[in-house]
C-alpha cells in the first residue's frame, strides 16, 4: 500500500541537495585556509541530522546545534554586512570589498544559500516533492529555523560599526518582518556594537530623494536607538558602480584602501 505523503505549499528539497551541500563544503574549505580543518562529511551528517526523520513543522534551533558547532567560524566582527531584500548586490559588494562579510560569505551561509530542504517524520527520506511554506504552512520548518539560527549567531558576533544594505526600491525599505528586522536587529549586542549604519540603495539613476527620511527608516532608527546603539543612514545612488570592480577585481583601487 503506497504511504500517504504530506503535501506542503512550498517547493520541495532542491534536487541533488546532499551532493550540493557536500560539494559546497569542499569548495569552501579549499578556498578558505582557516576552515581547512573542517571535515565535510561530518558537516553533512550534522546538517542531515537536523531535519531527517523529524516533522518539518517541528524543527528547533537545538536541532541545528551540532551543525553550528562544526561550522563555528571567526569573521572580523567589525566587518559585517547585513542585508535585507537586496541579496545579490550585497554579495557583489563583498566579492569586491573582500574584507567585509555577509552571512553567505561564511561556511554555513554558503552551504545553504538559495537551497530548500525538508524531511518527513519517522522516515529517513528527503522530501523532494514539497516543503512547508513559512506563511501558508508553518514557521518552524527546516529552512526558516536554519536561517533564524545562523542569522542570530551572526548578529550576536558583530561589533563596532555594523553595516546593513537596504533596498530603496521597495515600498518597505525596512521591513520588521524580514530576517534582518525580526532577528538580526534584535540580536546586535549593545555592549559590542557602537553603530548600525544603513546603506539605502537607490534604484533609479535619476533618483535624488533622501530615502533616509522614509518612515520605515525612522522606525528602524527608533528600534536601534532604544537598544542603545547609534544609528546612521546613508543614501547610495549609483549601485551600477559596484560592477566596476566585480568585472575588474584586480584593479588596485577596488580594495578597501583608496
Amino acid at each position: 500500500v503506497p504511504r500517504w505523503r504530506q503535501q506542503w505549499s512550498g517547493p520541495g528539497t532542491t534536487k541533488r541537495f546532499p551532493e550540493t551541500v557536500l560539494a559546497r563544503c569542499v569548495k569552501y574549505t579549499e578556498i578558505h585556509p582557516e576552515m581547512r580543518h573542517v571535515d565535510c562529511q561530518s558537516v553533512w551528517d550534522a546538517f542531515k541530522g537536523a531535519f531527517i526523520s523529524k516533522h518539518p513543522c517541528n524543527i528547533t534551533e537545538e536541532d541545528y546545534q551540532p551543525l553550528m558547532k562544526l561550522g563555528t567560524q571567526t569573521v572580523p566582527c567589525n566587518k559585517i554586512l547585513l542585508w535585507s531584500r537586496i541579496k545579490d548586490l550585497a554579495h557583489q559588494f563583498t566579492q569586491v570589498q573582500r574584507d567585509m562579510f555577509t552571512l553567505e560569505d561564511t561556511l554555513l551561509g554558503y552551504l545553504a544559500d538559495d537551497l530548500t530542504w525538508c524531511g518527513e517524520f519517522n522516515t529517513s527520506k528527503i522530501n523532494y516533492q514539497s516543503c512547508p511554506d513559512w506563511r501558508k504552512d508553518c514557521s518552524n520548518n527546516p529552512v526558516s529555523v536554519f536561517w533564524k539560527t545562523v542569522s542570530r549567531r551572526f548578529a550576536e558576533a558583530a561589533c563596532d560599526v555594523v553595516h546593513v544594505m537596504l533596498n530603496g526600491s521597495r515600498s518597505k525599505i525596512f521591513d520588521k518582518n524580514s530576517t534582518f528586522g525580526s532577528v538580526e536587529v534584535h540580536n546586535l549586542q549593545p555592549e559590542k556594537v557602537q553603530t548600525l549604519e544603513a546603506w539605502v540603495i537607490h534604484g533609479g539613476r535619476e533618483d535624488s530623494r533622501d530615502l533616509c527620511q522614509d518612515p520605515t527608516i525612522k522606525e528602524l532608527e527608533s528600534i536601534i536607538s532604544k537598544r542603545n546603539i547609534q544609528f546612521s543612514c546613508k543614501n547610495i545612488y549609483r549601485p551600477d558602480k559596484f560592477l566596476q570592480c566585480v568585472k575588474n577585481p584586480e584593479d588596485s583601487s577596488c580594495t578597501s584602501e583608496i
Epitope: D210, C233, N235, Y237, K241, Q244, C245, K247, S253
Partner: antibody, heavy 120, light 107 residues
Framework: QVQLVESGGGLVQPGGSLRLSCAAS????????MNWVRQAPGKGLEWVSA????????SYADSVKGRFTISRDNSKNTLYLQMNSLRAEDTAVYYC?????????????WGQGTLVTVSS | DIELTQPPSVSVAPGQTARISCSGD??????VYWYQQKPGQAPVLVIY???KRPSGIPERFSGSNSGNTATLTISGTQAEDEADYYC??????????FGGGTKLTVL
Amino acid sequence: QVQLVESGGGLVQPGGSLRLSCAASGFTFSSYYMNWVRQAPGKGLEWVSAISMNGDYISYADSVKGRFTISRDNSKNTLYLQMNSLRAEDTAVYYCARDLPLVYTGFAYWGQGTLVTVSS
Amino acid sequence: DIELTQPPSVSVAPGQTARISCSGDNLRHYYVYWYQQKPGQAPVLVIYGDSKRPSGIPERFSGSNSGNTATLTISGTQAEDEADYYCQTYTGGASLVFGGGTKLTVL
C-alpha cells in the same frame, strides 16, 4: 600609478566651441564613472558633468546643460568634453576626475587641468 | 538641491587644531568628501566617506559628519597644511555639489 592628462584648452571667442580630452592610464578606465570639474579664476570648484562606465548614463550641471556634451572612448582610455556656445562665465581651469569605487561618489584622482578662456 | 556652506577662512597657530565646518540640510544622510588645494595645483582628496583617510594622507587629518554639519579636523596643524579646503557631497542624479571653500591660514 593613476594618471589623468587633460588637453584641448585655449582661447576661444564667445559663442565658439572647444573640445577637451583627458587621457587616462594606470587603471581600468572602463570600470569607472568619469567627471569634469571646473574652477573659474579665483573661485571655487564646480562639478560640470559625469559619465558612467559604458556611457549609458550621463548627467550635467544646470549651468552647462544643452551646451556641453561628455563622452568617452574606452578603447582609447579617453574622456571628452565638447563645449559649444561658450560664454565668458565658462572661463575656468577644467579638470578631469575619476570617481571613487563602490558606495562612494567623490573624486579619488584629478588631472592637472587645462585652461579655457572665453573672451573676445 | 542641497547647498553646502563653509566659512570663507579659518586661522590656526602651528601645532594647534584647525576645524573647518561644512553645513547642509540633513547632511548626515550623505557621504562627505574633503579636498585640499594649494595655489596652482589640482585638488587632492584628504577625506572620503565622512571620515576615511586615503593612503598617503597624514593621520592628523580626520573627518566627522552628524546632524547638518560635517567637520574636517586637522590636529597639530603644520605650515604645509595652509591651503584651500573644499567639502563635497552627492545627492543623486545631477546633484553633485561642492562647498564654497575655506582658506586655511597657518599663523
